[in-house]
């Protein structure tokens, strides 16, 4: 099912243009900004979503770094180069010929350079830590119930297999969701943890990417879980290469 047939829309990506011009008059949807055909039965790649977002730019965001190897998206929004499969190209450059290497979630993992900069491979982000703070509640959430609801959310809303949700930690009011997915573990058809994390990030900001589906309504035993802030840390299979100047 490439898209909803009735009114020809893309349930998993509202940043698309859809028309019944696929094989046999089937609904086909293309991502804004790139024109790449997307599979509307699953999440659209973060690269294509960022590219689409640049046609309606919003404020960039800034996160903090918890340790020497964890990366955060300090650079905010940029118009990325995506490969034909919708993945980030290893090397990204801006209009002024400034270039840098990114990981599989599009976060810069080297110092910026010029057009001579080489990025030999797209390094996989295999571990994502989503750090949330929830709004005050009368009492703490039951950890087991919270864990179950978050695992179900990632499975049912983002189609991420439960085996990739490594852990859910909770110390009121902080919730940490650990996603792990090595290259060897990711089978064809599996949602990428980077894409799931991006959809989740947009959801908790009230910027849902889903078409015609309600916004995120997360409840634990009927009690709403409202997120105050989100920090996302990315760990790559190969540590990033920054100069010492950046680390001080």
């Amino acid at each position: 099912h490439t898209a909803a047939q009735d009114n020809c829309t893309c349930p998993t990506n509202k940043m698309t243009v859809c028309s019944p011009d696929g094989p046999g008059g089937r609904c086909q949807c293309r991502a804004l900004g790139s024109g790449v055909a997307v599979d509307c039965s699953t999440l659209t790649s973060k690269c294509l979503l960022l590219k689409a977002r640049m046609s309606a730019p919003k404020n960039a965001r800034t996160l903090v770094r918890p340790n020497e190897h964890a990366l955060v998206d300090n650079d905010g929004l940029y118009d990325p180069d995506c490969d034909p499969e919708g993945r980030f190209k290893a090397r990204q450059c801006n209009q002024t010929s400034v270039c840098w290497c990114v990981n599989s979630v599009g976060v810069r993992r080297t110092d910026k350079g010029d057009l001579s900069l080489r990025c030999d491979e797209l390094v996989r982000t295999h571990h994502i830590l989503i750090d949330l703070r929830h709004r005050p509640t009368a009492s703490a959430f039951n950890h087991s119930d919270l864990d179950a609801e978050l695992r179900r959310l990632f499975r049912e809303r983002y189609r991420l297999h439960p085996k990739f949700v490594a852990a859910v930690h909770y110390e009121q009011p902080t919730i940490q969701i650990e996603l792990r997915q090595n290259t060897s573990q990711k089978a064809a058809g599996d949602v990428d943890i980077g894409d799931a994390a991006y959809y989740f990030e947009r959801d908790v900001k009230g910027e849902s990417l889903f078409q015609g589906r309600g916004g995120l309504d997360l409840r634990v035993r009927g009690e709403p879980l409202q997120v105050e802030r989100t920090l996302i840390y990315y760990l790559d299979e190969i540590p990033p290469k920054f100069s010492m100047k950046r680390l001080t």
Epitope: H1, P11, E149, R152, R159, H161, R213
Partner: antibody, heavy 118, light 109 residues
Framework: QSLEESGGDLVQPGASLTLTCKAS????????ILWVRQAPGKGLEWIGC???????TYYANWAKGRFAISKTSSTTVTLQMTSLTAADTATYFC?????????????WGPGTLVTVSS | YDMTQTPASVSEPVGGTVTIKCQAS??????LAWYQQKPGQPPKLLIY???DLESGVPSRFKGSGSGTEYTLTISDLECADAATYYC????????????FGGGTEVVVK
């Protein structure tokens, strides 16, 4: 690849009973196990589910509190039932999802019969 | 999420066509399965994702629908098709009373 239920029995009203689902030929970590029951001559009734990876459990609204699903080893899942009544008389099936993120049940055990009667 | 299945029973001659309908109380985004069950046996998955045939299932079985309305059509009925058929929403395990429809008994004359 197979699933097999065991533990079905004739029990008195008010009793408790634990059923076991044994998996063989596949890695349970890649799947969820669901329990479904069927009263004699009636339809299928979904009881609950466990994500084997992580161990999270989910129940039908009517089953919450009286039924508990848990993983007891790398190849077994149990269904604990308490305060049994005649209405719980049924064949109990365990089933496996297809390894995707949906809940399509492509492998079932043969079922085990639970009879609640005085 | 509740599933309403109709009719409860249907009888058709060999070579005929049977249509079974299933309605979900909310949109289940095509995440619907159809099962066939014969007496004394566990259910067997026939169709998943509303219209995809499970391996080994004859193409006489056809699933369709979207949103909240789904249909199973069995054409060129054979005696072996006599069974009870169930739909199941495969979208969520949260806040449900039963993931299955009530079942449809198909009698082949």
């Amino acid at each position: 690849q197979s699933l097999e239920e065991s533990g079905g029995d004739l029990v008195q009203p008010g009793a408790s009973l634990t059923l076991t689902c044994k998996a063989s030929g596949f890695d349970l970590n890649n799947y969820s196990i669901l329990w479904v029951r069927q009263a004699p001559g009636k339809g299928l009734e979904w009881i609950g589910c466990i994500y084997f990876s992580g161990g999270s459990t989910y129940y039908a609204n009517w089953a919450k509190g009286r039924f508990a699903i848990s993983k007891t080893s790398s190849t077994t899942v149990t269904l604990q039932m308490t305060s049994l009544t005649a209405a719980d008389t049924a064949t109990y099936f365990c089933a496996r999802d297809d390894g995707t993120t949906s809940y399509y049940l492509n492998l079932w055990g043969p079922g085990t019969l639970v009879t609640v009667s005085s | 999420y509740d599933m309403t299945q109709t009719p409860a029973s249907v009888s058709e001659p060999v070579g005929g066509t049977v249509t079974i309908k299933c309605q979900a109380s909310e949109d289940i985004y095509n995440l619907l399965a159809w099962y066939q069950q014969k007496p004394g046996q566990p259910p067997k998955l026939l169709i998943y994702a509303a219209s995809d045939l499970e391996s080994g299932v004859p193409s006489r079985f056809k699933g369709s629908g979207s949103g909240t309305e789904y249909t199973l059509t069995i054409s060129d009925l054979e005696c072996a098709d006599a069974a009870t058929y169930y739909c199941q929403q495969a979208y969520t395990v949260g806040n449900i009373d039963n993931a299955f429809g009530g079942g449809t008994e198909v009698v082949v004359k």
